[in-house]
């Protein structure tokens, strides 16, 4: 018996020795039972016999995948020959908090890299890490279910002032960051222009340095700096701003050309190139993709391209001269 | 949950004006753009434009273009679509739709759709 | 602007079967998106950037393609999958949907 024709060598499988040709002959009637998938799995040809040499394939439910060989096969004694195989959940369950704690979004599964903001009523803050990501069927940093709001210095010292600022009778007046910073606030990537470099420091301090005039300190990501994709785009998007028309300040950030405010969760969201204004005294000659002609582009246009991670080489500032 | 929920169907003579609305709930409303799509009798769907709540930024395609308004309003996390003279023409369905962000920029689809608002125009 | 092809306009087919739809833009675009909508129902998203399923989409849809080129198949149709489909692409303005593709039981 073979499940495939035999037009020539028969095939062995991975790490299997016997060749189909070898296998015993067999009674029709014998075979295996149907076997039972892993949890959260599936048998895709699902039937009650099988025959000796006959593979199913283990497929998993919405929300999980495969982990391992995910095909079992029917061995003539009647047992299946099996590889470790689960199905693994490739979606975060919304996480268990005390009622205190807001999380944004709401949603009841979270896809991996999506992130969740935990917020607390006005005048407290997250006794701990307020972002979390969805990395494959966990949350980064784990979520404790102890975590709770605690009440928010920063709030208690700015009073009516800006964020980085405190009442001061009747005024306002910037932080000390010495003084003022020795309560626990969460921490923030940010790059200082001076130095040219980037570090962590914690929200107070950042803030407080910020309104002391520090122009040269730029916000970066909520969290600790960490290699990847968002410290990229964070440097790339610090260098471009020196040239943006618009700065709307955003919670910790500011916001460009290329944004939008979210009023909800403070942060800065790319527009779609589509959505860019059009025209504009900031302009830059740019190579797209693998393409080799060149294109007059906006900041607005240039932001959101870099944004998106989309393959652009800026040749120069100002219009293509061709 | 999320939910846009449009306001009933309408039956207009020619000329006439209309504003029909799109009522949003179960998210940060003023932080996602609105779009306004039409969809003719039996044909597909066709993109009108758009409103960001929290500024009312506006993007309209432009056949669309001085043909209708757009219009939000924040307090209430409303979106509207509006008419000051009715053609025959303008009978569709119209549908209005999220576009929602992910991670730090909007995408390019719409996640959330409208109930719809059917528009018939006759005299 | 981008015009978005979608071939063929009507596909007959018997749930079990194989089906491939096709949409075909003008110019190049960076992401397709596909959407299904049901007589009487609003669209519902169903593929995103070109070829993600939206949450709670079966795994026998999947998108591929790049360029101008793109498909939406299904590898083993179910009596639920009959309905019409639409691409859709924004990668420059206006934002166009293809003219849809009705799948219908054979």
């Known amino acids: 018996f073979s499940i495939m024709e035999n037009n020539g060598q028969p095939c062995i499988n991975d790490d299997e020795e016997m060749k189909e040709v070898d296998l015993p002959e067999i009674e029709a009637d014998s075979g295996c039972p149907q076997p039972v998938p892993p949890e959260n799995g599936f048998i895709r040809n699902e039937k009650q016999l099988y025959l000796v040499g006959e593979d199913v394939e283990i497929s998993c439910l919405t929300g999980f995948e495969t982990v391992g060989y995910q095909y079992f096969r029917c061995l003539p004694d009647g047992t299946w020959r099996q590889g470790d195989v689960e199905c693994q959940r490739t979606e975060c369950i919304k996480p268990v908090v005390q009622e205190v704690l807001t999380i944004t979004p709401f949603q009841r599964l979270y896809r991996i890299g999506e992130s969740i903001e935990l917020t607390c009523p006005k005048g407290f803050v997250v006794a701990g890490p307020s972002r979390y990501t969805c990395q494959g069927n966990s949350w980064t940093p784990p979520i404790s279910n102890s975590l709770t709001c605690e009440k928010d210095t920063l709030t208690k010292l700015k009073g009516h002032c800006q964020l980085g600022q405190k009442q001061s009778g009747s005024e306002c007046i910037c932080m000390s960051p010495e003084e003022d910073c020795s309560h626990h606030s969460e921490d923030l990537c940010v790059f200082d222009t001076d130095s040219n470099d980037y570090f962590t420091s914690p929200a107070c301090k950042f803030l407080a340095e910020k309104c002391l005039n520090n122009q040269q300190l730029h916000f970066l990501h909520i969290g600790s700096c960490q290699d990847g994709r968002q410290l990229e785009w964070g440097l790339e998007r610090t260098r471009l701003s020196s040239n943006s028309t618009k700065k709307e300040s955003c919670g910790y950030d500011t916001c460009y050309d290329w944004e939008k405010c979210s009023a909800s969760t403070s942060k800065c969201v790319c527009l779609l190139p589509p959505q860019c204004f059009k025209g504009g005294n900031q302009l830059y000659c740019v190579k797209m993709g693998s393409s080799t002609s060149e294109k007059t582009l906006n900041i607005c246009e240039v932001g959101t391209i870099r944004c998106a991670n989309r393959k652009m080489e800026i040749l120069h500032p100002g219009k293509c001269l061709a | 949950q999320v939910q846009l929920v449009q306001s009933g169907a309408e039956v207009k003579k020619p000329g006439e004006s209309l504003k029909i609305s799109c009522k949003a709930s179960?998210?940060?409303?003023?932080?996602?753009?609105i779009n306004w799509v039409r969809q003719m009798p039996g044909k597909g769907l066709e993109w009108m434009g758009q409103?960001?709540?929290?500024?009312?930024?506006?993007n309209y395609n432009p056949s669309f273009q001085g043909q209708v308004t757009i219009s939000a309003d924040k307090s209430i996390s409303t979106a509207y679509l509006q008419w000051s003279s009715l053609k025959a023409s303008d009978t569709a369905m119209y549908y209005c739709?999220?576009?929602?962000?992910?991670?730090?920029?909007?995408?390019?689809?719409?996640?959330?759709w409208g109930t719809g608002t059917t528009v018939t125009v006759s005299s | 602007e981008i015009v978005l092809t979608q071939s063929p306009a009507t596909l007959s087919l018997s749930p079990g079967e194989r089906a491939t739809l096709s949409c075909r833009a003008s110019?190049?675009?960076?992401?397709l998106h596909w959407y299904q909508q049901k007589p009487g129902q609003s669209p519902r998203l169903w593929i995103y950037?070109?070829?993600k399923r939206a949450t709670g989409i079966p795994a026998r849809f999947s998108g591929s393609g790049s360029g101008t080129d793109y498909t939406l198949t299904i590898s083993s149709l179910e009596p639920e999958d009959f309905a019409v489909y639409y691409c859709?692409?924004?990668?420059?303005?206006?934002?166009?949907f293809g003219q849809g593709t009705k799948l219908e039981i054979k």
């Open positions: 739709a999220r576009e929602g962000y992910y991670g730090y920029t909007y995408v390019e689809y719409f996640d959330v």
């Open positions: 179960g998210y940060a409303f003023s932080d996602y753009w």
């Open positions: 409103i960001y709540p929290g500024d009312d930024d506006t």
């Open positions: 110019s190049s675009v960076s992401y």
């Open positions: 950037d070109t070829s």
């Open positions: 859709q692409q924004w990668t420059s303005n206006p934002l166009t």
